[in-house]
Amino acid sequence: VPRWRQQWSGPGTTKRFPETVLARCVKYTEIHPEMRHVDCQSVWDAFKGAFISKHPCNITEEDYQPLMKLGTQTVPCNKILLWSRIKDLAHQFTQVQRDMFTLEDTLLGYLADDLTWCGEFNTSKINYQSCPDWRKDCSNNPVSVFWKTVSRRFAEAACDVVHVMLNGSRSKIFDKNSTFGSVEVHNLQPEKVQTLEAWVIHGGREDSRDLCQDPTIKELESIISKRNIQFSCKNIYRPDKFLQCVKNPEDSSCTSEI
């Protein structure tokens, strides 16, 4: 007798999800010597344990603690790059500027980047048909809770000057409902973080507006200042320069200090 399956509004688990996570883990630990000690099978078991057999609208940060523990990683706390609504460019930047790190440059962020996953209550099956949508179904779904958990930990680890890359082409340059606006901003530690420097990336070739005067940036400045962290904003006008360096990664002068 076929079991009734809950239909969610979001896309289902990414195909070949277990194989993808395991393969990414192996690749990451091969490339990063400091993570060579990680047992990727244990990582997958912990990842799976966070959502399998659990109702996909009842996931908690606690469910991910075994995975967090296995994926514990030290990145230079003064070289953290946060981003909001401009992931690809942020990743191009850290691909070139190798001494800076986005969340997706860490093991846990790398494992889950661009993937979707969920299970079903009381069965060991992975749901490849549909998963809960954050808005239409529920916020405590496996994917949202994972990113909230790792984002909080990443922000808590930051120190000195923290950079955030923001998309100047969007109507809300700073969106307080984004992961950056709702999680990371509030988990920067004032006793460790001296300054948050926002890089507002301009899209248009002839764009010469001062987007640091945007009302949403003023809102961000207000939130950060109230947390006793200094705020700085810079207009960045030529994002194509990142790509030029990415195309020529052998050119060390793109990456090194001048």
């Epitope: 930047f93 070139v96 500027q97 890089w199 301009h202 070739r205 002839e206 764009d207 010469s208 507006r209 001062d210 640091c212 005067q213 700085s232 904003c233 810079k234 207009n235 960045i236 006008y237 030529r238 194509d240 320069k241 990142f242 030029q244 360096c245 195309k247 020529n248 052998e250 050119d251 002068s253 793109c254 990456t255 001048i258």
Partner: antibody, heavy 120, light 107 residues
């Protein structure tokens, strides 16, 4: 090490033309924006023109727009500035300058300059 | 377009601290660069991104940028620091601008 060597300067009459070249070495030329900056005798620095690495984007100061054309040949590691309808006020030392990478838009390296004199 | 204003000249005794200012509307929203130029020579980048020093530039050179003013500071000024200094910023499109320059005299 990075080297930029300008050539093509000289004496030209008002209304005349001149083509400056800048031979680059010591870095991956196509990765960088390149620029021309000039300095009139006894005066300050003035940015003239810039070009992206690929080279799809070109930029010009208002003072030269429509008269000067920047271009590059990445296979030859060479930057050019075609100057037409020259005026006395274009008299200056012209420097070729390599942009800084990534989020920075300033000049990491400069050539020694080539003198352009516009006079009848 | 932003306009960058520098004092035409600054004098300092050897070993003292020289400060050269560069002002423009909301300059803090843009990265500022400083160049040193000696007579008959090409400019040399001494500070980029407001406060970063290129390799080979002595530690006595430092920079800051807040409000409407960027400042180049030379601590323990030496005779060899006598030169013209230019600030520069970029405000998008074809708006790459230099300040008018400051002549630093070491007395």
């Amino acid at each position: 090490q990075v080297q930029l060597v300008e050539s093509g300067g000289g004496l030209v009459q008002p209304g005349g033309s001149l083509r400056l070249s800048c031979a680059a070495s010591g870095f991956t030329f196509s990765s960088y924006y390149m620029n021309w900056v000039r300095q009139a005798p006894g005066k300050g620095l003035e940015w003239v023109s810039g070009i992206s690495g690929d080279p799809s984007n070109t930029y010009y100061a208002d003072s030269v727009k429509g008269r000067f054309t920047i271009s590059r040949d990445n296979s030859k590691n060479t930057l050019y500035l075609q100057m037409n309808s020259l005026r006395a006020e274009d008299t200056a030392v012209y420097y070729c300058a390599r942009d800084l990478p990534l989020v920075y838009t300033g000049f990491a390296y400069w050539g020694q300059g080539t003198l352009v004199t516009v006079s009848s | 377009d932003i306009e960058l204003t520098q004092p035409p000249s600054v004098s300092v005794a050897p070993g003292q601290t020289a400060r050269i200012s560069c002002s423009g509307d909301n300059l803090r929203h843009y990265y500022v660069y400083w160049y040193q130029q000696k007579p008959g020579q090409a400019p040399v980048l001494v500070i980029y991104g407001d406060s970063k020093r290129p390799s080979g530039i002595p530690e006595r050179f430092s920079g800051s940028n807040s409000g409407n003013t960027a400042t180049l500071t030379i601590s323990g000024t030496q005779a060899e620091d006598e030169a013209d200094y230019y600030c520069q910023t970029y405000t998008g499109g074809a708006s790459l601008v230099f300040g008018g320059g400051t002549k630093l005299t070491v007395l």
